[in-house]
């Protein structure tokens, strides 16, 4: 079941999926001046069996000006611009991508890929949040949001990470030092 919405955004933070559940789709988007090849896939799909998950289909972009040149999927470091899923200020590795059964790793970039990746997540997907540069978490450690099915509708749990600037913290003198990170957003423990 696909999640109806994108993961929630929260002030002064970015999110990233560390691994993608089977069923996740990634749009084959090309950067300005390029388009998908005529017979090319619309999206990549995370599929797998009990032991191994991988991305089906390949995204291929060609120049909008030329009709017959096709470019193979080749990682090009200079093409790896900022994307929604790679905006973190520092590495976050709360899970080992490879060790999660039923999940795919981050797909490698393809030549002339668009600067922002558009994922279509499935129920059970988890994304992790981190404060942007210049802000710090009131609580240390990762905070996440999970796509859940409740009452027949999908929804993302509200992340519990609070990111605060130095000036904001100074309004609250003499208070306890933050220790741990609350996670997720409450959802009923009983499903409908």
């Amino acid at each position: 079941e696909l999640c109806d919405d994108d993961p929630p955004e929260i002030p002064h933070a970015t999110f990233k999926a560390m691994a993608y559940k089977e069923g996740t789709m990634l749009n084959c988007e090309c950067k300005r001046g390029f388009r998908r090849i005529k017979s090319g896939s619309l999206y990549m799909l995370c599929t797998g069996n009990s032991s191994h998950s991988s991305w089906d289909n390949q995204c291929q972009c060609t120049s909008s000006a030329t009709r017959n040149t096709t470019k193979q999927v080749t990682p090009q470091p200079e093409e790896q611009k900022e994307r929604k899923t790679t905006e973190m200020q520092s590495p976050m590795q709360p899970v080992d991508q490879a060790s999660l059964p039923g999940h795919c790793r981050e797909p490698p970039p393809w030549e002339n890929e668009a600067t922002e990746r558009i994922y279509h997540f499935v129920v059970g997907q988890m994304v992790y949040y981190q404060c942007v540069q210049g802000y710090r978490a009131l609580h240390r450690g990762p905070a996440e949001s999970v796509c859940k099915m409740t009452h027949g509708k999908t929804r993302w749990t509200q992340p519990q990470l609070i990111c605060t600037g130095e000036m904001e913290t100074s309004q609250f003198p003499g208070e306890e030092k933050p220790q741990a990170s609350p996670e997720g957003r409450p959802e009923s423990e009983t499903s409908c």
Epitope: P8, H139, Q160, I162, T164, Q171, A180, R185, P186, E187
Partner: antibody, heavy 116, light 107 residues
Framework: QVQLVQSGAEVKKPGESLKISCKGS????????IVWVRQMPGKGLEWMGI????????RYSPSFQGQVTFSADKSISTAYLQWSSLKASDTAMYYC?????????WGQGTLVTVSS | DIVMTQSPSTLSASVGDRVTITCRAS??????LAWYQQKPGKAPKLLIY???SLESGVPSRFSGSGSGTEFTLTISSLQPDDFATYYC?????????FGGGTKVEIK
């Protein structure tokens, strides 16, 4: 389902102490920020502050700093709001809610009346 | 603190009317704004978050718009159940602040 149940209405005299409660159920209580909100009679909503029941990290609104204390007992999934010396101006409805941003789940409120 | 100013403070309307409530922030809050409905003796109920996202189970006649410092809550066709007080709330800072409220009453 997710529920926050608050303790019953209180009538107190100025100078008395008071502790009201907010019990969470249907979710993992220690993992979520609890927000306290005051509503004085016929007035709007005011954010008092937040507490993380997992480790009792607190943040108070400057208006309420030193006037109230937040605490939590995770063994019974309950957050508390307390006063050591009540004033007539503390007369209000007090709500707990699950935060920290938009407040999706609320307690039913506890009416505190302080009168001599 | 970020100051939230709501207008009007009272609004008289009839069933079927299109109703618009405005909320202004004293500084830019991006889209970090929520709207609540409160009925007498009850806790507030979340209607909209992130300025325009409709909370699950809230009727589609409610909509929110705006960003930066100017926001609106619109009820496209007022229903008898909609007579209540409405509050905006910013969460650009975790030190939350609410607007003063708009009471929607029967004309």
């Amino acid at each position: 389902q997710v529920q926050l149940v608050q303790s019953g209405a209180e009538v107190k005299k100025p100078g008395e102490s008071l502790k009201i409660s907010c019990k969470g159920s249907g979710y993992s209580f220690t993992n979520y920020w609890i927000v306290w909100v005051r509503q004085m009679p016929g007035k709007g909503l005011e954010w008092m502050g937040i507490i993380s029941p997992g480790d009792s990290t607190t943040r108070y609104s400057p208006s309420f700093q030193g006037q109230v204390t937040f605490s939590a007992d995770k063994s019974i999934s309950t957050a508390y709001l307390q006063w050591s010396s009540l004033k007539a101006s503390d007369t209000a409805m007090y709500y707990c809610a699950i935060g920290p941003y938009y407040l999706e789940y609320w307690g039913q409120g506890t009416l505190v009346t302080v009168s001599s | 603190d970020i100051v939230m100013t709501q207008s009007p403070s009272t609004l008289s309307a009839s069933v079927g009317d299109r109703v618009t409530i405005t909320c202004r922030a004293s500084q830019s809050i991006s889209s970090w704004l929520a709207w609540y409905q409160q009925k007498p003796g009850k806790a507030p109920k979340l209607l909209i978050y992130k300025a325009s996202s409709l909370e699950s189970g809230v009727p589609s006649r409610f909509s929110g718009s705006g960003s930066g410092t100017e926001f609106t809550l619109t009820i496209s066709s007022l229903q008898p159940d909609d007579f209540a007080t409405y509050y905006c709330q910013q969460y650009n800072s975790y030190s939350l602040t609410f607007g003063g409220g708009t009471k929607v009453e029967i004309k």
